[in-house]
Amino acid sequence: MACLGFQRHKAQLNLATRTWPCTLLFFLLFIPVFCKAMHVAQPAVVLASSRGIASFVCEYASPGKATEVRVTVLRQADSQVTEVCAATYMMGNELTFLDDSICTGTSSGNQVNLTIQGLRAMDTGLYICKVELMYPPPYYLGIGNGTQIYVIDPEPCPDSDFLLWILAAVSSGLFFYSFLLTAVSLSKMLKKRSPLTTGVYVKMPPTEPECEKQFQPYFIPIN
């Protein structure tokens, strides 16, 4: 999103149609002055996966050429703010969080792809992306509006051994059922086919001369 000053001057530019060359010059000269604030964009809502993983993109419009960027994820719930994770990275390098961090991420230009793991229903809340351009000076701060992450806990899993027994019993049952079904079907088929077993196949001449390679068998029952 362009900064507010930019939008205001854009509106003025639309009004000043007759004096557009002057206005355009003014507009071009003053864009750098009015667009110094750093804006951070992030999705409004994200639903965590059943495994408690949520991913979202945090994008910032950089007003300067930063070489060192700090990204912090904050969680806001019930007016309480806590730091989820933070990482400082050099532009062009990989984003590295601490080993014990629940966050992982990758950076690409002015975009940071963040993934938060190990989330549970109680972790539902507003996750705010804070970007700071640390080096070289001047320092710039950008705070996103936040991504509401919804986490739904999966149904509690029964004991794994018990689950294996159930799985084994079900698969065995299905195997025997399919085996039985196959046997019954085969026996029925054989019974139906029994009066047709005595017969001979006779090779007939082709109906059309060009189809010499095609043979049409004709079944003649023998009483």
Epitope: V33, C35, K36, P137, Y140, L141
Partner: antibody, heavy 120, light 108 residues
Framework: QVQLVESGGGVVQPGRSLRLSCAAS????????MHWVRQAPGKGLEWVAV????????YYADSVKGRFTISRDNSKSTLYLQMNSLRAEDTAVYYC?????????????WGQGTLVTVSS | EIVLTQSPGTLSLSPGERATLSCRAS???????LAWYQQKPGQAPRLLIY???SRATGIPDRFSGSGSGTDFTLTISRLEPEDFAVYYC?????????FGPGTKVDIK
């Protein structure tokens, strides 16, 4: 409760040096950015410098750049301001303040200040 | 650097009246990064508003902040005797973190 106590102020001659200290208590010092803000007698507030949590990043006002150095000792919960090549215009009450955690550097707690007078 | 201008320089009002203080920036300041402070004689400043409109801990709801871009406002809905002081705005979106020159609210 949060407390910030400045010390080290006094009268000093132009061109000389002075070191200010700020002892912090009542909060986890190493989690916060810390600032120095000054106020000349009868004048408004002027931001001087900031130092990040770990001391790696420091930023200064143009008027003090190259003369003042901000530093911190997290083990002692103390903030410092080393002032070199002092000028008459550096005469002010120097406040140590804490950056509001998370949402940028608005200053939520301030010390009572220490007066620095640069005079010959 | 971002230069902040405050108006009026002095505001003379009576207790119970509404005070409207203005802060204008030379460049666009995201609304997330503007703060207001109150300072009484012989005291350190006190944070009132951060993020242009969020009240700091313990600040009464008669204080409210608004604005975006380059124009910001601090409103005191009903002046109490303890509200007569100097008010400063500050931007912290980019370094150097500048303050405005202040607006003095005194008793008429």
């Amino acid at each position: 409760q949060v407390q910030l106590v400045e010390s080290g102020g006094g009268v000093v001659q132009p061109g000389r040096s002075l070191r200010l200290s700020c002892a912090a208590s009542g909060f986890t010092f190493s989690n916060y950015c810390m600032h120095w803000v000054r106020q000349a007698p009868g004048k408004g507030l002027e931001w001087v410098a900031v130092i990040w949590y770990d001391g790696r990043n420091k930023y200064y006002a143009d008027s003090v750049k190259g003369r003042f150095t901000i530093s911190r000792d997290n083990s002692k919960s103390t903030l410092y301001l080393q002032m070199n090549s002092l000028r008459a215009e550096d005469t002010a009450v120097y406040y140590c303040s804490r950056g509001l955690l998370w949402f940028g550097e608005s200053l939520d707690y301030w010390g009572q200040g220490t007066l620095v007078t640069v005079s010959s | 650097e971002i230069v902040l201008t405050q108006s009026p320089g002095t505001l003379s009002l009576s207790p119970g009246e509404r005070a409207t203080l203005s802060c204008r920036a030379s460049q666009s300041v995201s609304s997330s990064y503007l703060a207001w402070y109150q300072q009484k004689p012989g005291q350190a400043p006190r944070l009132l508003i951060y993020g242009a409109s969020s009240r700091a801990t313990g600040i009464p709801d008669r204080f409210s902040g608004s604005g975006s871009g380059t124009d910001f406002t601090l409103t005191i809905s009903r002046l109490e005797p303890e509200d007569f002081a100097v008010y400063y705005c500050q931007q912290y979106g980019s370094s150097p973190f500048t303050f405005g020159p202040g607006t003095k609210v005194d008793i008429k």
